[in-house]
């Protein structure tokens, strides 16, 4: 650590008076201090004599001795007063700059201790201190205000009492700046803007901030706007606002618009986009297929989304059947809004009964004209199965009859005993029947097939099965032949109601 | 060994705001007092201010635009220079301000244009 | 204008002895301690001359320095091609509370 000599905390000189600080260390040595116009400065390998041979009010301050090589950085220092009847202060610095609720140090030295006790801090012109002002003094570093408030930023003076008679010093600013969490807020209205060519538009960018020192612009496809700003201060906070109005849009006025507010901790920015058409128009579309399929008994959620500007002047969902003339429950049909331009309008359909199957419209109107947007709704059902035996053309003749959506796809089985469904270890033989005639297929209804087994002669103890499947589930009906005549048997978890 | 870099935007739109930050390496800068100064192009040099930790003293001819402020975490100090025009523009250095007023260490200079 | 006032040009042969000179006013180089600056072409200054007459590490014992009054001069003996710089004086000022300088001199190496 570095020696200063004369090895006392603080020194008090006369002004005129001759000063030598001697600085010792092991390598070189440095002097820091306030920067003063009267010392004079000899270095000397590892000593630095720091001196004056007129020391005047301004060489009021603590001098520190460095070793700049010395890896823990030690230090020594000295507290030196020139006490001049005429100025008790020395002013270190003209403004003082903190954020809110930091102590703010204000540099006034005093250059006489013996003053100390007759010290005080005053606003300029004598005006006292704002209430709830709290601060401390140190004759060898100023005037502390503790946790210093935006309110206070003021210009200050320290005052002493010498002979009866309170001396000012030169005043101090200080500049008490609020804690800015980071960039303006920001606000670009609208986020999105359409317009037919010649209607009149407003587009607003506004930034606010807790302190006032931010700058806010807009720019139109990279070109900033000269507009007029407007500021105002409310909720503690500042804002600048710019308004641009056009009376009649053109193509040139579409593109893109950003909204730019930069302060010290950084810049934010904003945009939104303007499309200038030369009509109304109004689109539908769906990201689900216009058709669709659905199990019996399952919901489903008819989805459009809109288009339009300008605005949607009436709207509807209706049913087109074929089944019956009633239309959808208003209370299913639901709309959202994306934005101002687009919306999205959903049917909900829970539930669906055999009789909802069909087509359903989604309307809408604005001064564009009428667009419609149509769903095919088909209900897929399991099979349903019935055999019953019969003779065509002479021969005995099994004949299944399966309805359902999609197609069923028809299997005959032949089994040993009687049985309601015959299982693996009782098959005696299996028939598909890729071809079953269609006996009806119409838009939104069941498909009927019917699939014929011929059979010479019934086998008493056996059971004969008919078995349909599609994507939905299945349906099986078994036939027992039996002395008396013909028996049947649908399957028990047949029973079946949507 | 103390080093400095001025860093900072080299192009300012008339009217606007010179922002400029120091970064001091090899020495902490609440130690120090430090300056700034300018000097326009094939001219000599002008003082605008120094700063250490407890506040600042501006050149009165630039006092109202100038504001300087010192950032101890992150060793930098900084230099606000406010409704800039041509006569702005010049390469802008910072430096150590000794006890005697001596600027012993100086940044490199970072050139500021004031353009539109 | 500078506060303090330079020759804008000086030079001299290597080898050979110049001075530059820097004259000022009661509030600066008449109260105060000089310094001198030496600018390289493209260059940062660099503080060649302290307290007058003192040189920081590094710099060669050619280059001194001297105060008389409100004046004060820079001579550089010895000279060689590396010594072509802009040399500036600089001394505080007391009213304006920080350091002036002068316009500077161009040193050529001829």
């Known amino acids: 650590i570095p020696v200063i000599e004369p090895s006392v905390p603080e020194l008090v000189v006369k002004p005129g008076a001759t000063v030598t600080l001697r600085c010792v260390g092991n390598g070189s040595v440095e002097w820091d201090g306030p920067p003063s116009p009267h010392w004079t400065l000899y270095s000397d390998g590892s000593s630095s004599i720091l001196s004056t041979n007129n020391a005047t009010f301004q060489n009021t301050g603590t001098y520190r001795c460095t070793e700049p090589g010395d890896p823990l950085g030690g230090s020594a220092a000295i507290h030196l007063y020139v006490k001049d009847p005429a100025r008790p202060w020395n002013v270190l610095a003209q403004e003082v700059v903190v954020f809110e609720d930091q102590d703010a140090l204000l540099p006034c030295l005093l250059t006489d201790p013996v003053l100390e006790a007759g010290v005080s801090l005053v606003r300029v012109r004598g005006r006292p201190l704002m209430r709830h002002t709290n601060y401390s003094f140190s004759p060898w570093h100023g005037f502390t205000i503790h946790r210093a408030k935006f309110i206070q930023s003021q210009d200050y003076q320290c005052s002493a009492l010498m002979g009866g008679r309170k001396v000012m010093s030169i005043s101090i600013r200080l500049k008490v700046q609020k804690v800015i969490p980071g960039p303006p807020a920001l606000t670009l209205v609208p986020a999105e803007l359409v317009r037919i060519r010649g209607e009149a538009a407003q587009i607003v960018c506004s930034a606010s901030s807790v302190d006032v020192n931010f700058d806010v612009f807009l720019q139109h496809n990279n070109t900033k706007l000269a507009i007029p700003q407007q500021s105002d201060f409310h909720n503690n906070r500042y804002q600048k606002v710019l308004t641009l109005n056009l009376d009649q849009v053109d193509f040139q006025h579409a593109g893109n618009y950003s909204c730019v507010a930069s302060n010290v901790q950084g810049k934010h920015s904003t945009s939104m986009f303007f499309r200038v058409v030369e009509s109304a128009y109004l689109n539908l579309s769906s990201e689900q297929n216009l058709i669709q399929e659905v199990t019996v008994g399952e919901g489903l959620n008819l989805k459009v989304m809109v288009e339009a500007y300008p605005g949607l002047q009436g709207f509807n969902w209706t049913y087109l059947g074929p089944f019956s003339d009633h239309q959808p429950e208003p209370k299913l049909a639901n709309a959202t809004t994306k934005d101002t331009y687009r919306h999205t309008f959903t049917l909900s359909l829970p539930r669906l009964k055999p009789s909802e199957a069909g087509r359903y419209s989604f309307l809408a109107r604005n001064p564009g004209g009428w667009r419609a947007l149509t769903f095919e709704l088909t209900l897929r059902y399991p099979p349903e199965v019935s055999v019953i035996w019969t003779f065509i053309n002479g021969s005995g003749t099994l004949l299944c009859a399966a309805s359902g959506y999609p197609q069923p796809n028809v299997t005959w089985l032949q089994c040993s005993g009687h049985t309601d469904r015959c299982d693996e270890a009782q098959v005696l033989q299996v028939w598909d029947d890729p071809y079953p005639e269609v006996l009806s297929q119409e838009p939104f209804h069941k498909v009927t097939v019917q699939s014929l087994l011929t059979v010479e002669t019934l086998e008493h103890n056996q059971t004969y099965e008919c078995r349909a499947h599609n994507s939905v589930g299945s349906g099986s009906w078994a036939f027992i032949p039996i002395s008396a005549g013909a028996h049947t048997h649908p399957p028990d978890e047949f029973l079946f109601t949507p | 060994q103390v080093q400095l870099q001025e860093s900072g935007p080299g192009l300012v739109k008339p009217s606007e705001t010179l922002s400029l930050t120091c970064t001091v390496s090899?020495?902490?800068?609440?130690?120090?007092?430090w300056s700034w100064i300018r000097q326009p192009a094939g001219k000599g040099l002008e003082w605008i201010g120094r700063?250490?930790?407890?506040?600042?003293t501006k050149n009165p001819s630039l006092k109202s635009r100038v504001t300087m402020s010192v950032d101890t975490s992150k060793n930098q100090f900084s230099l606000k220079l406010s409704s800039v025009t041509a006569a702005d523009t010049a390469v802008y250095y910072c430096?150590?301000?000794?006890?005697?007023?001596?600027?012993?260490?100086w940044g490199q200079g970072t050139l500021v244009t004031v353009s539109s | 204008q500078s506060v303090l006032t330079q020759p804008p040009s000086a030079s001299g042969t290597p080898g050979q002895r110049v001075t530059i000179s820097c004259s000022g006013g009661s509030s600066n180089i008449g109260s105060n301690t000089v310094n001198w600056y030496q600018q390289l072409p493209g260059t940062a200054p660099k503080l060649l001359i302290y307290?007058?007459?003192q040189r920081p590490s590094g710099v060669p014992d050619r280059f001194s320095g001297s105060k008389s009054g409100t004046s004060a001069s820079l001579a550089i003996s010895g000279l060689q091609s590396e010594d072509e710089a802009d040399y500036y004086c600089a001394a505080w000022d007391d009213s304006l509370n920080g350091p002036v300088f002068g316009g500077g001199t161009k040193l050529t190496v001829l």
């Open positions: 307290s007058n007459n």
């Open positions: 700063i250490y930790t407890s506040g600042s």
């Open positions: 430096a150590r301000l000794t006890v005697v007023g001596a600027l012993d260490y």
């Open positions: 090899g020495g902490s800068i609440s130690s120090y007092y």
